[in-house]
Each structure stands twice: as C-alpha cells, then as structure tokens.
Interface confidence: low
C-alpha cells in the first residue's frame, strides 16, 4: 500500500494521530492518551480497483474481473480507497464495572490502504 | 450489516454468485465451480458513516468522531460501502507445479457490509 506523500492523489495511507482527549474518551481509556490511527484517502481509478494487495484481495480480484468486463452491476460500482490491513493495539481501559482491563483491541491502526 | 432487499439504497450486502468458468479460472480451480462471493453497495450518508459494526469498527468509530465534528480532512472524506466481515472458504486447485492443493482461502465471502 502507498504512503501519501502529497505528490499523488492515488489511494494511499495518510498518517493521523488520534487524541482520546479530543474525542472525549479520556474518561474511560486510561492508556494510551492517543495513537497513530492513520486513514485512507485518494482516487481509485478503474485500473487499480481491486488491487488492495491484502485482506480483501481474493474477493476484490474476483469482483474486479467482472468490473473490467463491464459486467452489470459492477461497471457502475464505485471503487473505494479503504483500509485493507489493520493492526491491533494494546489498551488499558475501564469496563462498565470500573475494572481496569488490558486488552489487544483489533483493527485499531490502518497499516495499508487499497481500492475495494 | 443490512441485506439488500431492493427497498433501501443504504449500504447493504448484495447476493452474488461467482462462476469460475465465467472469469476463466476453471483451468486451475478444481472445486468448487463457483461460490456466493456477494458484494457491498449503497449509500453511506454521514450519520451512518463508521457504523460498520464489525472489523473496521474501532478505527471507523474514531474517524467518525472527527468527521461528525467537521474536523478537516474528514469532513470531506467520502464514506464508502465496503466489506466489514469476510469469511474464508475451502478450495481445491492446481499450484504452479500442477500439484493439487486443498486450502482455506481467506476473505472470499462477504458476510457483512458497512460504511468505512
């Protein structure tokens, strides 16, 4: 997956730091105070649709076969720049019973972006 | 995730059968001859962006917090109807050396759709 460098407008991963204080979650999340969540942005022209290279690969490759052949309804289906690989992160937080929980939360960090 | 029923245009899962013969893969895929891959389609208005309810949930919920507050660059970031839960499937196929391989291929079947 591409890293956004400001030079291309093709689907890429953009660095972004989330502050839990900013979104009002610091009352239940003990640590960390924030993290690099990142996000995906950019265009998905038809020639790179389905080139996610990761988690959606088989499915998106199959769908792209139909899309490239102009098969309805895929010809009009817009391809999107989305996370294709996400990574977990350890967090320390309070549960409803005010117990302190340490847990790996799945899909917190965007590692790669691709066109759906 | 919603199932598409033709009545709504909100992001939903659409049933779709893939025929390996149709896409010219029947020369290397022994079985099955096809499968219900499904796909996602529909609108993602801002109030349901980030409500994937599954694999992208934490990340998309966080990003949506910023989006709902009109935080640049997320306010203009378009939310997409994408697979949020995929399922593997067993396949029998020939590898490059013409050996017969039986393998669970990850992320073949779209189980749920959501707004990124």
């Amino acid at each position: 997956g591409l890293e956004c460098d400001g030079k291309v407008n093709i689907c890429c991963k953009k660095q972004f730091f989330v502050s839990f204080k900013d979104i009002g979650w610091n009352d239940w999340i003990i640590a960390p105070s924030g993290y690099h969540a990142n996000y995906c942005e950019g265009e998905c022209p038809s020639h790179i649709a389905g080139t996610s290279g990761s988690s959606l690969s088989f499915h998106s490759t199959v769908i792209n076969h139909y899309r490239m052949r102009g098969h309805s309804p895929f010809a009009n289906l817009k391809s999107c720049c989305v996370p294709t690989k996400l990574r977990p992160m350890s967090m320390l937080y309070y549960d409803d019973g005010q117990n302190i929980i340490k847990k790996d939360i799945q899909n917190m960090i965007v590692e790669e972006c691709g066109c759906s | 995730g919603l199932e598409c029923d033709g009545k709504v245009n909100i992001c939903c899962k659409k049933q779709f059968f893939v025929s390996f013969k149709d896409i010219g893969w029947n020369d290397w895929i022994i079985a099955p001859s096809g499968y219900h891959a499904n796909y996602c389609e529909g609108e993602c208005p801002s109030h349901i962006a980030g409500t994937s309810g599954s694999s992208l949930s934490f990340h998309s919920t966080v990003i949506n917090h910023y989006r709902m507050r009109g935080h640049s660059p997320f306010a203009n970031l378009k939310s997409c109807c994408v697979p949020t839960k995929l399922r593997p499937m067993s396949m029998l196929y020939y590898d490059d050396g013409q050996n017969i391989i039986k393998k669970d291929i990850q992320n073949m079947i779209v189980e749920e759709c959501g707004c990124s």
Partner: antibody, heavy 121, light 107 residues
Framework: QVQLVQSGAEVKKPGSSVKVSCKAS????????INWVRQAPGQGLEWMGG????????AYAQKFQGRVTITADESTSTAYMELSSLRSEDTAVYYC??????????????WGQGTLVTVSS | EIVMTQSPATLSVSPGERATLSCRAS??????LAWYQQKPGQAPRLLIY???TRATGIPARFSGSGSGTEFTLTISSLQSEDFAVYYC?????????FGGGTKVEIK
C-alpha cells in the same frame, strides 16, 4: 533469555519513601507489562500495580492508590516502583514480574529476584 | 475486584500420592487463570497459565483444569521437590488478584 534484576535490600524509617528498580534484559521492553507484587513475611502474594512501558501509564490496586508510583524508562529498560508514607506493615519482599508474551492477558512468566524492604524505627 | 479463594489452606500428602488443589473466583475469569509454585526464599515460578497450559519446562505431573469460577491444580505423583506453597492468580481483569495459597506439606 529474559532476566529481571532488582535493586538491593533497603531499610527505611516510617513515613519515608522507597524506590525499587527492576532492569529487564533479553527481550523487547516496551510492549510488555511490568507488574509489582509484594509478599509480607509469612503472607501471600499481593499485586500492587503494573505499567505498559510503551504507554508510560500505570494502573494500581486500590489499596495502594495514592501511595505507589510505577514508572518505566524505555532507554534503560528499567521499571521503578516507589512507595511513600511507609509504615511497618509495608515490610515485605517486593517483586517485579513480567508477562509471558506481548499482548494481553498473559501470566507472569518472568520474575525478579525480589527486594526486601524493612520499615523500622 | 475479583476475590480468589484457595482450599485447603494446608494439604498433607505422602510422596508418590496425588494432590488436588482448588481455586474459586468470585466472578468468572474465563480461562485467564495461572498457578504458581513458591519455595521459601525464592520468587514464584509459573506452572500453569490459561487454566490448563503448562509453562515451559514444567513436568507433565502438573495439570490444570477448569474455567469460569472453578479451577483445579493436580499433581499426579508428588516428588520431594514439589512440597511448596501454590498460588492461583486471575489475570482476566486488573486489579490482578491472587489466592491465599495452599501449602503442600509432607505427611
């Protein structure tokens, strides 16, 4: 091979503070919990609190809240436990312990040798 | 916090016999339970984690079972080096809590 090496025995006066160190070697320091467990003479094990060095934030057992401070220095792979307002009942062996694997909900596979803190006037 | 209760407090067993130690949690800890062995003047040693998985280098005579709130540590045939204090510990939630211990002594 993971090793946790603690600082030496201390004798302290009531009302004072003690700071015990725990130096880790033989593994990634940042992503693993370092926990502190104490054991008073002839008594059982008592969890005081823990820190995930990469976060730099600690959590403490309610009993010790406000009296204990757990910190970690990633540059030296060392964790510290400071206990203030010492009283005679704080006389105990203090252990640092580390979880078995990176991630969550793992037991303490690695233990320091223990530091005896004696509080006496 | 989750209270861990061990029984019996003391268990007198002859070498070669079987020892069964119990641990009860005040609420479910799933399988997030460990057993430790401690000998005088030594740090605790991890025996079992995940309620039933033996830690590296632990002999097969040690086995753990249970989930939720009821757990058991079994030592199938006690050796002289097994006479020690055994603690259960839940690590499902912080604060992490230990049981009061069971002392296994020679009969």
């Amino acid at each position: 091979q993971v090793q946790l090496v603690q600082s030496g025995a201390e004798v302290k006066k009531p009302g004072s503070s003690v700071k015990v160190s725990c130096k880790a070697s033989g593994g990634t320091f940042s992503n693993y919990d370092i926990n502190w467990v104490r054991q008073a003479p002839g008594q059982g094990l008592e969890w005081m609190g823990g820190i995930i060095p990469v976060f730099g934030t600690a959590a403490y057992a309610q009993k010790f809240q406000g009296r204990v401070t757990i910190t970690a220095d990633e540059s030296t792979s060392t964790a510290y436990m400071e206990l203030s307002s010492l009283r005679s009942e704080d006389t105990a062996v203090y252990y640092c312990a580390r979880e078995a694997r990176d991630g969550y909900r793992y037991a303490f596979q690695h233990w320091g040798q223990g530091t005896l803190v004696t509080v006496s006037s | 916090e989750i209270v861990m209760t061990q029984s019996p407090a003391t268990l007198s067993v002859s070498p070669g016999e079987r020892a069964t130690l119990s641990c009860r949690a005040s609420q479910s800890v799933s399988s997030n339970l460990a057993w430790y062995q401690q000998k005088p003047g030594q740090a605790p040693r991890l025996l079992i984690y995940g309620a039933s998985t033996r830690a590296t280098g632990i002999p097969a005579r040690f086995s753990g079972s249970g989930s939720g709130t009821e757990f058991t540590l079994t030592i199938s045939s006690l050796q002289s080096e097994d006479f020690a204090v055994y603690y259960c510990q839940q690590y499902n939630n912080w604060p992490i809590t230990f049981g009061g211990g069971t002392k296994v002594e020679i009969k």
